[in-house]
């Protein structure tokens, strides 16, 4: 018998049922690799609890239709009075990634799954070239599911202090280059998940091969690796890699772009921070209110709901869509169909379509965005259930009292797509959100700028136009609202830019929208502030022009006008300039932008090494130096010793070179001991040092080698910059 | 909330031993750098002995081959096994975990050596 859905077969996959504490294994075409359960058992149960495994379906005894898949087993159970036999049932619809099964419920004798994937769709246009699954369990049976971050079409650009190339990556799976508009990624070819462009060229240097893993607490990693056998003119002989490391941040915050953090001999080490690595429950709920203290957020959106018949409608072109939120649409034409979403064409009004019901609902929050997801509507011809996906955008001043109203933004394969601005999607403050802005491969970063909390001061800026007697202040932070402290006390509490005289405080806006890259400088416009009279509220832009080597200098207030509806501050600053690449000698480093100065000659040791042990090696290591060990040659900066016979490798000749990108401090040592393989390629090390106000000198910690490059981390206060 | 609390530090005399404890609630000690640091009045504090979630170890210059530094993930619990112990180990000793959100310290437990 042919395995129903064979894109499923290559993996052993995961179900929990949280209420029980309890962790399902299946594999759907063979069986699960757990003795406890049997050699032929495709749906293992393991009750944590109990600590108990039980099978509770056996690969021998499947039957399968286009959407179900059933197995049976030999083991006898009482249902109302009937003697049954105990079976998993797993229910299949059409999704646009591999999915994940998820645990609906279970009675005595039946234990029912669902699982939306590519695999149960009537038409291959979801379909991977190659795809893993994207989600795991935690020891906590928490599911952390980066299937939201996959994309169905083009790629993430990965940040990166190389002009010349540019890495792109997709999540889980390959990038699907033919439904792309970006002609960069055209040339990428089929099958890669990262696809270096250089030039006009493109490269595959990753696919998928292994499922998402947890290394530890909100750390997960994927790995890609390039099947061919051809190697790569400009990888030395070297198979490349990519590693993706997940984040999960511990506080609420935008989505950060992946980000670089290690590049030898194309192994591409990749950290991105993202609230999609956090586990599910932070993220997701049910209902129509979402709170999660871990990202301080609170969200309730029942006063959107309508009531009495009403619906809110938005017009498709082709169709008008009816809307409820947090219950069904009331509308005639849609009666009896429990859709939260309902789709009427124009030119026929007979002609119906559930888009989404209301009792299949998710609300999600995840990296800044606040998203609504209706699903199991009425089928299309592809097989896939018709969804609805509603972004929401926080807007204090929406009409229709604060509600607003849901606009069409387009439909994708079925999915139809909405945008939301209303006060109900307000997540307390953006705070530490998008403060920074992207030039094409520039970045600019303006959290340098960013005061927190006290004992640190707002800034203020300069106004030389008054005197003394009508002095006004102007306080301002950076991506944050102002802090209550000072002559700002009495400053409205999530104003991010405050005016304050002697007749009181004045809003001069608030941090609702990220800085813009405009005419060469950093545009931050602050909104939405007091009322100036005619019903408009006062609004402030401020211009930042780069100026390298200056954190200190505040902000000048250039002009204000339109009654005082509107202020105008251009501000010199390091923080405005593009971050950029910097090489040094003799231990140190200059970031010339930022006017950060890194001297790290205190951790070279004068005699002797530090010395990192493992269970088969101790690594010795030097800063800027050699290695004063033996058996270590004299010129090394590091070297690895073999507990067992005490052989020597030389993993690089010492040099003070220093590199400094973006907050990261890495210094190379190359030209050690070759391997013994076909290129003789020479051992190097990479250490990457990483600020770390409390840890002094701070030590070297081996994080692994990859192929021919010995990586260590290495926090310590000296890489902290000093604080202006 | 994350806790680290020390415990074992006592007075005992040179070339004695002692095994300090850290035990550690709010956090998976398995899955961090860990390690015991050491201070002595007027003088920042040092590290003796770190271990990272990938079992490689660290030692400082003077205390290599006499401490040792373990834990037991499933207690959640970092030892420090001080052997041939002097008087110029005498320090308060803190247990420190290093995660992605910021670093955490234990109060300290006093070991003096006489």
């Known amino acids: 018998q042919a395995a129903p859905f064979p894109e499923l077969c290559s993996y052993t996959w995961e179900a929990v049922d949280t209420k029980n504490n309890v962790l399902y294994k299946i594999n759907i075409c063979g069986s699960v690799d757990i003795v406890q359960c049997g050699p032929s058992s495709a749906v293992c149960m393991h009750d944590l609890k109990t600590r108990t495994y039980h099978s509770v379906g056996d690969s021998v005894l499947r039957s399968a239709t286009r959407s179900l898949l059933e197995f049976n087993t030999t083991v006898s159970c009482d249902q109302q009075g009937t003697n049954h036999r105990v079976q998993s049932s797993i229910a299949f619809l059409c999704g646009k990634t591999l999915g994940t099964p998820e645990f609906v419920t279970a009675t005595e004798c039946v234990h029912y799954f669902e699982w939306r994937t590519t695999a149960a769709c009537k038409k291959d246009i979801f379909k991977a070239n190659k795809e893993v699954p994207c989600y795991v369990f935690d020891e906590e049976l928490r599911k952390h599911d980066l299937n939201p971050l996959i994309k169905l079409s083009g790629a993430y650009l990965v940040d990166d202090s190389d002009p010349d190339t540019s890495l792109f990556i997709n999540v889980c799976r390959d990038i699907d280059t033919l439904r792309d508009p970006g002609s960069q990624l055209r040339a990428c070819p089929p099958g890669t998940a990262a696809c270096l462009v250089r030039g006009h060229q493109a490269f595959d240097v990753g696919q998928p091969r292994d499922g998402l893993k947890l290394v530890r607490k909100d750390r997960l990693v994927l790995s890609y690796v390039r099947e061919e056998a051809g190697k790569l003119d400009f990888c030395d002989g070297h198979s490349p890699a990519v590693t993706i490391t997940f984040v999960c941040p511990s506080e609420r915050r935008e989505g950060t772009i992946p980000k670089l953090t290690a590049k030898s001999n194309c192994r591409y080490e990749i950290e991105w921070i993202t609230e999609y690595a956090c586990h599910r429950d932070y993220l997701e709920s049910k209902t129509c209110s979402l709170s999660g203290e871990q990202q301080d957020v609170s969200i309730d959106l029942t006063p959107l709901a309508q009531s009495g018949g009403s619906s809110y409608i938005s017009d498709g072109k082709e169709y008008l869509f009816y809307l409820n939120v947090c219950g069904e649409t009331e509308i005639q034409f849609c009666n009896k169909k429990q859709a939260a979403v309902c789709q009427v064409k124009k030119s026929d009004t007979s002609q119906v379509k559930a888009a989404g019901r209301y009792h299949n609902q998710t609300l999600r929050y995840s990296d800044g965005d606040l998203t609504l997801i209706y699903f199991g509507g009425d089928e299309c011809s592809s097989g896939f259930q018709r969804m609805s996906v509603i972004n929401f955008e926080c807007n204090k001043t929406a009409g229709n009292d604060g509600k607003g109203t849901p606009v069409f933004t387009g439909e994708v394969d079925c999915t139809y797509f909405f945008t939301w601005d209303t006060e109900y999607a307000c997540v307390k403050e953006k705070e530490d959100l998008l403060c920074g802005a992207t030039d094409g491969k520039k970045r600019y970063d303006l959290s340098a700028l960013v005061r927190h909390a006290e004992p640190e001061q707002n800034w203020e800026a300069v106004d030389g136009s008054q005197t003394e007697t009508e002095k006004k202040h102007f306080f301002i932070n950076i991506c944050h609202r102002v802090l209550q402290e000072g002559k700002a006390r009495g400053c409205p509490e999530d104003a991010a830019v405050c005016a304050v005289d002697k007749n009181g405080s004045k809003n001069l806006g608030k941090f609702i929208s990220s800085p813009m890259k405009e005419k060469g400088n950093i545009q931050l416009s602050y909104s939405d502030g007091d009322d100036c009279g005619h019903g408009k509220k006062i609004k402030t832009n401020i211009t930042l022009v780069c100026k390298p080597g200056d954190l200190e200098s505040a902000p000048v207030l250039r002009t204000s006008g339109e009654g005082g509806c509107f202020y105008e501050f251009e501000w010199h600053t390091a923080a405005a300039c593009v971050l950029s690449k910097t090489e040094g000698e003799n231990c140190t480093v200059f970031d010339s932008q930022a006017g950060f100065s890194f001297d790290l000659s205190p951790l070279t040791k004068k005699n002797g090494a530090y010395k990192v042990e493992t269970k088969k090696y101790d690594f010795y290591i030097n800063v800027c130096g050699p290695v004063s060990v033996s058996p270590c040659q004299p010129d090394s900066g590091a070297c690895q010793v073999a507990k067992s016979d005490e052989k020597t490798w030389n993993l690089g000749l010492s040099n003070a070179k220093l590199s400094y990108y973006d907050g990261m401090i890495q210094l190379n040592y190359r030209g050690g001991t070759p391997y013994n393989n076909e290129r003789h390629t020479p051992r190097a090390t990479l250490i990457t040092f990483l600020c770390d106000r409390d840890a002094g000198v701070g030590f070297p910690e081996y994080q692994e080698e990859d192929n021919s490059t010995y990586n260590f981390r290495w926090y310590t206060s000296y890489a902290c910059p000093e604080e202006p | 909330e994350v806790q680290l609390v020390e415990s074992g530090g006592g007075l005992v005399q040179a070339g004695g031993s002692l095994r300090l404890s850290c035990a550690a609630s709010?956090?998976?000690?398995?899955?961090?750098?860990v390690g015991w640091y050491r201070q002595v009045p007027g003088k920042e504090r040092d590290v003796v002995a770190s271990i990272t979630s990938g079992d490689s170890t660290y030692y400082g210059d003077s205390v290599r081959g006499r401490f040792t530094i373990s834990r037991d993930n499933a207690k959640n619990t970092m030892y420090l096994q001080m052997n041939s112990l002097k008087p110029e180990d005498t320090a308060i000793y803190y247990c420190r975990a290093r995660t992605t959100d910021g670093s955490y310290w234990g109060q300290g437990t006093q070991v003096t050596v006489s």
């Open positions: 709010g956090i998976i000690f398995g899955a961090n750098t």
